[in-house]
Interface confidence: low
């Protein structure tokens, strides 16, 4: 039998994709298909020349993909060749522009950190201003693309470049960056599908900022005469630099005077020695080279007065947020009153003062 689908003559442009279809004859066992070019078995290249089903797919066609293609169907009974299909890969209409662009030279002169725009709400990420000079043929490029990547270490070549089409012909603003990172920048000219050579590379270190989110999952537990505070780092995208450590703030009460502790490095817990009963409330902030960031929501722990009471009440050592504390304390002490609301309001005022004092110093 003849082939169900014969490969067709095809014309394509450099850089485009092309597909040659082949449907082998019916046969038992089902014939397998191989592709041949100019009388030789075709070497497949993952990502560029691949076979899907029985079709040959060529992505990013090159001039040397031109030639005569045929597919060969093979099974136990023998081999059959398809018709020969002529494939012609032509230079694109952009070819002249491309040759011109190859002669363009871009000198990236300046990468400047812009002052953040005053906005309400979360602080925006950093933006930079790129400026470059163009030399070469009379016809300038139609557009320019910025390429940037983080440089994790001086020898780090692994980060992929991010590409952003720029809105200017000699300078442009670029966002999408993160505080506390070292970046490499370059600029590339283009016209249509043609691309010119990249500019020189400039480096810029974006300064660290204080973390824009608090540590996550702050918890308190008690044991062996101590209160243990533990937490998780803020989400990575809000670090705004390298987290050097954490500050833990304690609200003062009769049991524990107001205090703060600094935890250095990656450690995410702190032991506070105490033997006195009472409520313990803490907040945690992550610290970068720029200082301490946003404080976590207060978390409180009530240490009861004596073990006999703990035995009567199954809620031995329970963590609370400040908002829950009033309700739970009232339940524990048999309803409202006993000056508890006054104590709670005073605690809230002390918290606000402590936070204001903290932010005043950063």
């Amino acid at each position: 039998e003849d082939f169900q689908i014969q490969p067709r003559d095809t014309v394509a442009v450099v850089g485009e994709s092309l597909v040659l279809e082949c449907g082998p004859p019916w046969g038992y066992p089902k014939p397998s298909v191989s592709w041949w070019k100019d009388g030789k078995p075709l070497v497949l290249q993952p990502g560029r020349r691949t076979v899907s089903g029985d079709s040959l797919m060529v992505s990013r066609a090159e001039k040397n993909d031109s030639g005569t293609y045929m597919c060969m169907a093979t099974n136990n009974a023998g081999q059959r060749e398809s018709r020969a299909a002529r494939v012609s890969i032509q230079e694109s209409q952009d070819h002249k522009e491309h040759l011109e662009l190859l002669a363009v030279r871009i000198q990236l002169e300046n990468v400047t950190l812009l002052n953040p725009e005053p906005v309400k709400g979360p602080k925006p990420g950093p933006s930079v201003w790129l400026s470059w000079k163009v030399s070469g043929p009379a016809a300038p490029a139609e557009s320019y693309t910025a390429l940037f990547r983080t440089q994790r270490s001086p020898r780090d070549q692994g980060s992929p470049w991010t590409e952003v089409l720029l809105r200017g012909l000699q300078s442009a603003k670029l966002g999408g960056l993160h505080w506390g990172q070292d970046y490499e920048f370059k600029v590339r000219p283009s016209s249509g599908r043609a691309r010119g050579p990249d500019s020189n590379v400039l480096l810029l270190r974006l300064p660290e900022q204080v973390p824009s989110a608090p540590p996550q999952g702050v918890t308190l537990r008690s044991g062996n005469g101590s209160v243990f505070v533990s937490w998780a780092p803020p989400p990575a995208e809000s670090h705004n630099g390298v987290i050097r450590g954490y500050q833990v703030w304690s609200l003062g009460n009769a049991s524990l005077p107001a205090a703060n502790w600094t935890v250095v490095g990656e450690q995410t817990q702190l032991e506070i020695a105490t033997r006195l009963p009472g409520s313990y409330c803490v907040q945690v902030a992550a610290v970068t080279g720029a200082g301490a960031g946003e404080l976590s929501t207060p978390v409180c722990l009530l240490l009861e007065q004596a073990m006999e009471q703990s035995a009567r009440d199954p809620r031995k050592h329970v963590p609370w947020t400040l908002e829950q504390l009033r309700v739970d304390l009232e339940v524990l002490f048999q309803g409202p009153g006993s000056g508890l609301n006054d104590i709670f309001e005073a605690q809230k005022i002390e918290w606000h003062e402590a936070r204001a004092h903290h932010h005043h110093h950063h």
């Epitope: 983080t150 999408g176 996550q216 999952g217 989400p235 990575a236």
Partner: antibody, heavy 119, light 115 residues
Framework: QIQLQESGPGLVKPSQSLSLTCSVT?????????WTWIRQFPGNNLEWMGY???????DYNPSLTSRISITRDTSRNQFFLQLESVTTQDTATYYC????????????WGQGTMVTVSS | QPVLTQSPSASASLGASVKLTCTLN???????IGWYQQHRDKPPKYVMF???????SKADGIPDRFSGSSSGADRYLTISNIQAEDEAIYFC?????????????FGSGTHFTVL
């Protein structure tokens, strides 16, 4: 209204490459968003495979990094999935999707294309 | 990265209410999630965004019968006055950023049956 449509072969042989196209109408893929591939296995489990962003940045599911490639053609407003060395475990319905607002919360989905890996 | 746990199935009667749960592993208990509804032979449909603090934001066209809430590591999707068309698989999904690598994970889905 953004619309996405997947296309590609429904049957792929083991060890070969799976190639799918997502054609986008109603929005330019170079204007914004993350252009994403998600697949759903026969048991209904969903797996995020990777994305290409409007700026050309890519991230892949770590379990697929060695054999996945996502590319785009902005002139045709299409993006593509290529998965090398497929096995029967890659049999699934493949969806392209994109978030309308919050990243990774996918408001817009294609209808899906079923791909069977079998010899 | 986050792990999202959902119960395999749930059911409720017409006109009643149901609360579907998606639980994040403790390390990611503050994360926001998205809920999706999938009818048979259809792509998933985005329903809403539920924040760690319990706030939620519904997608366009989602009826008021659907609401979201949060408690600790649990994220909830509540459907009240259940209708026949609410029978579907409900998935939750969360995004993450691990050392600059962005990504997304999904729960295994809850098959919801209307009795």
């Amino acid at each position: 209204q953004i619309q996405l449509q997947e296309s590609g072969p429904g049957l792929v042989k083991p060890s070969q490459s799976l190639s799918l196209t997502c054609s986008v109408t109603g929005y330019s893929i170079s204007s914004g968003s993350l252009w994403t591939w998600i697949r759903q296995f026969p048991g209904n489990n969903l797996e995020w495979m990777g994305y290409i962003s409007y700026a050309g940045g890519i991230d892949y599911n770590p379990s697929l990094t060695s054999r996945i490639s996502i590319t785009r053609d902005t002139s045709r407003n299409q993006f593509f999935l290529q998965l090398e060395s497929v096995t029967t475990q890659d049999t699934a319905t493949y969806y392209c999707a994109t978030p309308g607002g919050y990243p990774f919360h996918f408001d817009y989905w294609g209808q899906g294309t079923m791909v069977t890996v079998s010899s | 990265q986050p792990v999202l746990t959902q119960s395999p199935s749930a059911s409720a009667s017409l006109g009643a209410s149901v609360k579907l749960t998606c639980t994040l592993n403790s390390q990611f208990s503050t994360y926001n999630i998205g809920w999706y509804q999938q009818h048979r032979d259809k792509p998933p449909k985005y329903v809403m965004f539920v924040k760690g603090d319990g706030g939620h934001s519904k997608a366009d066209g989602i009826p008021d019968r659907f609401s979201g809430s949060s408690s600790g590591a649990d994220r909830y999707l509540t459907i009240s006055n259940i209708q026949a068309e609410d029978e579907a698989i409900y998935f939750c999904g969360a995004d993450y950023n691990n050392a600059g690598q962005y990504g997304c994970v999904f729960g295994s889905g809850t098959h919801f049956t209307v009795l």
